[in-house]
Interface confidence: low
């Protein structure tokens, strides 16, 4: 889960102490320790309920079981023949909420859960075995998604039990490899600590040159794959058919970051459309120190010095539905 370890500035080693090698072996344990401490497995739960009063009206509730800071929630439902899906709502803790028909009302229930009501009339209304998916993007856990639908024999007014098992997606494909690396790192950390147990350590003291020492931030090992570093995209599922989770959103990741000034940790000035929706106050998505974004080939929420941007070369696909879904 999220940790923000203050890394004290190292004083130059005194003669006769460990020298440059001591520098490295002391910094590495700090980093590895942070990685080990942040290890954890968040979960997403989804609950789908058919309203007794309106048989084709659904309420979807989703929650994130993790201690990270949620930066985006995307709720989607399926498209025909597995050809794609439709985003129903996108909820951003600071920018507000957007929803598309047949979504009637999307809202934050708590700082880590949302609910969405779908209207039950018209061609775009859901059917009983529609699969709904919720995707939570958080720091440091990354992107987590779960899907749910009504059980086949659901009575109106009853709800499907929450489904907390997150679905493994392509953006989590590197999970095992990274976990293995981090496991090795943790073992190595213990080895280092044992090696240094009887050695004198250089003095540590806070930096006098900056008001705040740099923060070491790390991704949870279960989320540290390259693709998991992407800012999340909407999820795709089939409607009234078995769910398919192999189709990515036609675009690729969230957008308002593009207008954020460098180092900005606040919402840029803009229309008051967001102010009408009660939303929980939350922090910014990720600090500018997190250079991991550069590896992911995606634009970070806001960029810091020395961080290279790689705009998505794919661009959009031809679009015919809400959010451009075929």
């Amino acid at each position: 889960m999220r940790t923000e370890a203050q890394v004290p500035a190292l004083q130059p080693p005194e003669p006769g102490l460990e020298g440059a090698m001591g520098h490295r072996t002391l910094v590495l344990p700090w980093v590895l320790l942070t990685l080990c401490v942040t290890a954890g497995t968040p979960e997403v739960w989804v609950q789908v309920r058919m309203e007794a009063t309106e048989l084709s009206s659904f309420t979807i509730r989703c929650g994130f079981l993790g201690s990270g800071s949620i930066s985006l929630v995307t709720v989607s439902w399926g498209g025909p023949n597995g050809a794609g899906g439709t985003t129903l709502a996108v909820l951003h803790p600071e920018r507000g909420i957007r929803q598309w028909a047949p979504a009637r009302q999307a809202r934050w229930e708590t700082q880590s859960s949302i609910s969405l009501i779908l209207e039950g009339s018209g061609a775009s209304s859901p059917c009983a075995n529609t699969t709904f998916c919720c995707k939570f993007a958080s720091f440091p856990e990354g992107s987590w998604e779960a899907c749910g639908s009504l059980p086949p024999s659901s009575d109106p007014g009853l709800s499907a039990p929450p489904t907390p098992a997150p679905i493994l997606r392509a953006d989590l494909a590197g999970i095992l490899g990274v976990s293995g690396v981090l496991l090795f790192g943790c073992v190595y950390l213990l080895h280092l600590l044992r090696r240094h147990k009887h050695r004198p350590a250089p003095r540590l003291q806070p930096s006098r040159t900056s008001p705040q020492a740099p923060r070491a931030r790390a991704w949870a090992p279960s989320q540290a794959s390259q693709a998991a570093l992407h800012v999340p995209y909407a999820t795709i599922n089939t409607s009234c058919r078995p769910a398919t989770l192999d189709t990515a959103h036609p675009h690729g990741g969230p957008s308002w970051w593009a207008s954020l000034p460098t180092h900005a940790a606040h919402r840029p000035q803009g229309p008051a459309a967001w102010a009408s929706t009660p939303i929980p106050a939350r922090g910014s998505f990720v600090s500018v120190e997190n250079g991991l974004y550069a590896q992911a080939g995606e634009r970070p929420p806001h960029t810091g010095p020395g961080l290279t941007l790689f705009p998505d070369p794919r661009g959009p696909r031809a679009m015919e539905g809400p959010l451009g879904v075929r």
């Epitope: 775009s124 800012v231 794919r314 031809a318 451009g324």
Partner: antibody, heavy 129, light 107 residues
């Protein structure tokens, strides 16, 4: 301040290809974040969306015109272009280029501001022999 | 595609009066609706987006409301410069579709 300027022949013969160019000034097409759209307006009629392009070259067209439309982009010139083939008198219209804010394709999620906020002044194209 | 229908086709209003324009979508577009103003010989100008949010520089006498399939543009007190044609446009689905327009003329 981003400005758009359409250019191209005002008269096209039937069955030929209509070609228009929109030059973007005050901003870069390559910066991403916008659709660059073409819209037309028949004399005394309403507006019809033709299609859009993104700086990467990705396009989407109105199904009613899809078989005849090609939109392309030249980022080095900061321009995007419209080609409409096999024109008839029914294609006589004022053609506008516009910037559509609705989605930011660079990263893919909806923006929190929508609609075509910047338009060219329009260019009249007459299809006649 | 979603068909947008505006009414009335023409609205005659005296300066200083209130004007109410309607737009109906053939299917729900949630709140994804924009309004444009067009004067003769000029390009359309974005007034309202996302159903009720005024675009930059648009005076507060313009307001939008509605959701789903029924939308309204209200001009609280018509000024001389407000006499024009107004179009609604849905931005919920592709292709983008516009209404046929409502002409607001001086009574």
């Amino acid at each position: 301040q981003v400005q758009l300027q359409e250019s191209g022949p005002g008269l096209v013969k039937p069955s030929q290809t209509l070609s228009l160019t929109c030059t973007v000034s005050g901003g870069s097409i390559s910066s991403g974040g916008y659709y660059w759209s073409w819209i037309r307006q028949h004399p005394g009629k309403g507006l019809e969306w033709i299609g859009y392009i993104y700086y990467s070259g990705s396009t989407s067209y109105n199904p009613s015109l899809k078989s005849r439309v090609t939109i392309s982009v030249d980022t080095s010139k900061n321009q995007f272009s419209l080609k409409l083939s096999s024109v008839t008198a029914a294609d006589t219209a004022v053609y506008y280029c516009a910037r559509d804010l609705d989605y930011d394709i660079l990263t893919g999620y909806p923006r929190w501001d929508y609609g075509m906020d910047v338009w060219g002044q329009g260019t009249t194209v007459t299809v006649s022999s | 595609e979603i068909v947008m229908t505006q009414s009335p086709a023409t609205l005659s209003v005296s300066p200083g009066e209130r004007a109410t324009l309607s737009c109906r979508a053939s299917q729900s577009v949630s709140n994804n609706l924009a309004w444009y103003q067009q004067k003769p010989g000029q390009a359309p100008r974005l007034l309202i987006y996302s159903e009720s949010t005024r675009a930059t520089g648009i005076p507060d006498r313009f307001s939008g409301s509605g959701s789903g399939t029924e939308f309204t543009l209200t001009i609280s007190s018509l000024q001389s410069e407000d006499f024009a044609v107004y179009y609604c446009q849905q931005h919920n689905n592709w292709p983008r579709t516009f209404g046929q327009g409502t002409k607001v003329e001086i009574k």
